[in-house]
Amino acid sequence: TPEVWVQVRMEATELSSFTIRCGFLGSGSISLVTVSWGGPNGAGGTTLAVLHPERGIRQWAPARQARWETQSSISLILEGSGASSPCANTTFCCKFASFPEGSWEACGSLPPSSDPGLSAPPTPAPILRADL
């Protein structure tokens, strides 16, 4: 069964700056990744970035840099200034659309006890939804 993992890290240098990393553990080819915050995409969450493996990347504030890390994982840096900046308990979600598995989404937030610059290892987050 495919899994999606989500890792959220607060940057030591900028305490209101976050890095979100997401990955897809499955055999299919990824056709789209959507990163949102405040809940799952389409369920109250606000889209931060949409990444297509070949067409390109679209991102919106406070997202500063979305990029592919590997063929099955992405990262997103969030700028921590202004009214729309994230806080420590913000939930971030990543939805991977892949063929032939369908869509798989998982969410994560900053570990409660984490120090700036540290984070839990990127273990699979609970899968919230699988749309086949």
Epitope: P53, E54, G56
Partner: antibody, heavy 114, light 113 residues
Amino acid sequence: EVQLVQSGAEVKKPGSSVKVSCKASGGTFSSFSIEWVRQAPGQGLEWMGEILPGSNSTNYNEKFKGRVTFTADESTSTAYMELSSLRSEDTAVYYCSSYWFAYWGQGTLVTVSS
Amino acid sequence: DIVMTQSPDSLAVSLGERATINCKSSQSLLNSGNQKNYLAWYQQKPGQPPKLLIYGASTRESGVPDRFSGSGSGTDFTLTISSLQAEDVAVYYCQNAHSYPPTFGQGTKLEIK
């Protein structure tokens, strides 16, 4: 198949504003950004910016910041581009586009002339 | 901003012959993470909006004839029409899809010789 249908041609006076609409059908309007691109007569393509209808999040080309506003109405699946303080060099065909420029509207000619 | 420069500005090719258009970007369009080049090619005929031909430097958009092909990596890219047809007369644009703002080349006008 996504279809984008734009509003008709406009003739405007210098200093005024124009608002161009782009109605989408056949796809999920809120999932992908609506891009705006303009093309002056005989010239190339110039990206103006984009709006993500689901959240009204926007990105603007620095060249147009302060003069252009993107809005979207999810209830009618329509995106809007408003350009203010028009000058003669804004005479161009304005296009909306979606899904990484895979789908395009037919274009709206805006003529700025006194 | 990434500057896209196409060559030549115009090109005349006989029907059935090969047409080649080059595009050079001022910065690399290669995403090192997934080894994909974020470059697209468009065809525009008079009075019509641009039509997406190629994305990811080499992937044909659905419905595009296989005589159109894209190649290249990093900063140097090529659009090739293997056997020119009358309906291919148009202006062709390359586009940076790698970073904001998306920027287009100045265009290459393709005509029949």
